[in-house]
């Protein structure tokens, strides 16, 4: 019939697709590290760059005092590669500094702090031996994964030796997160 | 010690191209993020743009139809071209570094006034 | 565009006072606040970064604090050579933007 509209009979509700650029999404690069306070019992965290170069962030999701934000509840992936150089000459005082039963390593952790929780949780850790590599190394590690993570959680990113860290090019050290 | 020296013409005359150069010695250009900023004479401070080792680029809103930041990695040198000036672009210009935002202007050039007349 | 308003524009004191000089940004910047130091005729002179972060070099009469929108530049006990102008400038986002200078006078 002419006009006539006819409704299916199992009637479904979509929600309407979210444009991926709305969604909180960051990446943020490596920049010179000022020497820092840290607990005891944690590496010390990174400083970043926010808004230079490649670093961006984007709808809400903010980066201040060594965390990122997350501005709403959801699945995000979060990354990070940290690239560390230094000499074979370094490793003896890598062991003196404060680890003398570890091997000579080099330690990235991604770390969620949680308001209502009391203690930071890791997420994500890399580890790699360096002593045994050439007299000038560079070692990247690489970390990514997808998370759960609820509005107001905070994200930072944790390393063994922060004066190891190269921080000489944006696209060797970074970090960030986006929802999905 | 890280240095930067501003260079180029003093006087340009109304609706041409003013073009500066700033040299940096005592250190690499690569890693860091160098501006130019300019003051009028007796006003405030004006940040122009800056430009990035790899050649990326970001201007003021203000003046981005007339701007123009290069790098030349090789001389470790960075250039300004401002194109169209009027006499309100009189003003000294210095060069500066900045080594992340976290951290602010930490090495300026002396400054080069130019002066925009006919 | 960050609007960063400087008071007071000009201030007079003699050697060996503390001054206090504001710096308020039209949002919050969280800690990216800078302070220069321009002597006539030369280039300003970065003396805190990060709002309250002394430059190398720099003497520790001057100090920073403040965070998110209101931020103040102390000078604890003044020297002849610290007469000059003094200038905020945000670094929180592009386009960087400067607040139009306090003016320290002898008295």
């Known amino acids: 019939l002419k006009g006539q509209e006819f409704a299916p009979s199992h009637q479904q509700v979509y929600a309407p697709l979210r444009a991926d650029g709305d969604k909180p999404r960051a990446h943020l690069t490596v920049v010179r590290q000022t020497p820092t306070q840290h607990f005891k019992n944690q590496f010390p965290a990174l400083h970043w760059e926010h808004e230079l170069g490649l670093a961006f962030t984007k709808n809400r999701m903010n980066y201040t005092n060594k965390f990122l934000l997350i501005p709403e509840s959801g699945d995000y992936f979060i990354y990070s590669q940290v690239t560390f150089r230094g000499m074979t000459s370094e490793c003896s005082e890598i062991r003196q500094a404060g680890r003398p039963n570890k091997p000579d390593s080099i330690t990235v952790v991604i770390t969620k702090v949680t308001d209502s929780y009391p203690e930071p949780t890791q997420l994500l850790m890399g580890t790699k031996s360096v002593c045994e590599v050439g007299s000038n190394w560079f070692q990247p590690i690489y970390l990514g994964a997808m998370f759960s993570l609820q509005e107001g959680d905070k994200l930072m990113v944790n390393v063994s030796d922060i004066s190891l860290v190269d921080y000489t090019k944006e696209d060797k050290t970074f970090f960030g997160a986006f929802l999905l | 010690q890280v240095q930067l020296q501003e260079s180029g013409p003093g006087l340009v005359k109304p609706s041409e191209t003013l073009s500066l150069t700033c040299t940096v010695s005592?250190?690499?250009?690569?890693?860091?993020?160098w501006s130019w900023i300019r003051q009028p004479p007796g006003k405030c401070l004006e940040w122009i743009g800056y430009i990035y080792y790899s050649g990326q680029t970001k201007y003021n809103p203000s003046l981005k139809s007339r701007v123009t930041i290069s790098i030349d990695t090789s001389k470790n040198q960075f250039s300004l071209k401002l194109s169209s000036v009027t006499a309100a672009d009189t003003a000294v210009y210095y060069c500066?570094?900045?080594?992340?935002?976290?951290?602010?202007?930490?090495?300026w050039g002396q400054g080069t006034l130019v002066t925009v007349s006919s | 565009d960050i609007q960063m308003t400087q008071s007071p524009s000009s201030l007079s004191a003699s050697v060996g006072d503390r001054v206090t000089i504001t710096c308020r940004a039209s949002q919050s910047i969280n800690n990216y606040l800078n302070w220069y130091q321009q002597r006539p005729g030369k280039a300003p002179k970065l003396l805190i970064y990060a709002a309250s972060s002394l430059q190398s070099g720099v003497p520790s009469r001057f100090s920073g604090s403040g965070s998110g929108t209101d931020f103040t530049l102390t000078i604890s006990s003044l020297q002849p050579e610290d007469f000059a102008t003094y200038y905020c400038?945000?670094?929180?986002?592009?386009?960087?933007?400067f607040g139009c200078g306090t003016k320290l006078e002898i008295k």
């Open positions: 500066a570094r900045e080594t992340g935002s976290y951290y602010g202007f930490d090495y």
């Open positions: 005592g250190g690499s250009i690569s890693s860091y993020f």
């Open positions: 400038q945000q670094s929180y986002s592009t386009p960087r933007t």
